[in-house]
Amino acid sequence: SGTTNTVAAYNLTWKSTNFKTILEWEPKPVNQVYTVQISTKSGDWKSKCFYTTDTECDLTDEIVKDVKQTYLARVFSYPAGNVESTGSAGEPLYENSPEFTPYLETNLGQPTIQSFEQVGTKVNVTVEDERTLVRRNNTFLSLRDVFGKDLIYTLYYWKSSSSGKKTAKTNTNEFLIDVDKGENYCFSVQAVIPSRTVNRKSTDSPVECMGQEKGEFRE
């Protein structure tokens, strides 16, 4: 039920990568607008994206306050031009989102290989420590700051001249691997959070190869 021509939002979906978090829903509005509210399980509701015709709402600023909390959002539907109007029960029509715990559920963004440096038969590969929108003491935290040792990187590497891959793991952002002298290697990394049961792995980084710009060689 509800006000004539007003329909409740549906398919409420959290889209979140490295804590950048947007709530999406359907349908595209026809003669109606939406307002979103978000709260923690024990907290008060906070309104966002007032009377919008969009079908998404950026809730990053709210969830980064405590990424380990579990959040619930709801989307209210109002008739366009008559936002004071309520449904038959005396309340606006609304739909609840699934619960969302950013620390456990945000997708890991595609990592980037920042650099690699060869010294003799060793190569140091460094993964860029991506900045998130999570803040502490007025500074933005990196992915490593947020996840600490919970975050692992898996490195795949192979000789440019062959297809046989090797792998290494680190719970820092650096790998030190052994290579054959005089051979060029290619590298790709993947982020993993072992303790998770969902959204555990990122996609692989772009491949970077020795002999290209990111690398440095020293005897």
Partner: antibody, heavy 117, light 107 residues
Amino acid sequence: EVQLVESGGGLVQPGGSLRLSCAASGFNIKDYYMHWVRQAPGKGLEWVGWIDPENGNTIYDPKFQDRFTISADTSKNTAYLQMNSLRAEDTAVYYCARDTAAYFDYWGQGTLVTVSS
Amino acid sequence: DIQMTQSPSSLSASVGDRVTITCKGSRDTTSFVSWYQQKPGKAPKLLIYYATSLADGVPSRFSGSGSGTDFTLTISSLQPEDFATYYCLQHGESPFTFGQGTKVEIK
């Protein structure tokens, strides 16, 4: 409940081939790394290789690179070990295991492969 | 390749004894070392990961220590169900390698 069930083992002649399967239930294999580990009778554990089923990346112990191939079918939630040019010394129990990246937390019961004429 | 040299290969102990098993890597293995228990005819079971972290459901009499190249599994007070073979595994870089195993037998 997480479960790994290997199948496909049996008696094969030297030079022959065998394909082992590791059927997973209770989780999605694409979210993990999947390994094959073998154990010859009365001997220790020996790592064969791994696959990331999500992107198909495979890593092998070099001693198996030329004869063994690991693959996965995410629609069947199953990992495979294709073994070619089998030798008597490949006789072993073959286990598949799930890797969280921090540890191998679940193992199958194993399937016995016997290479003999 | 990193070799993991495990010792002793076997030991005899009594219930209540403190048992120590060591694994030495041929070079630095970072912290990706885990320990497994295997009983005859059964699959290995995870005991310790990240060299020192106790796996879920594993009794607190099991502990792991070490870093770099030297790692130790300790059973503080051996119980009847602990008679088994124990393996270390380094999985910080490929090829991943197991120690040769330590068989813990009843004295």
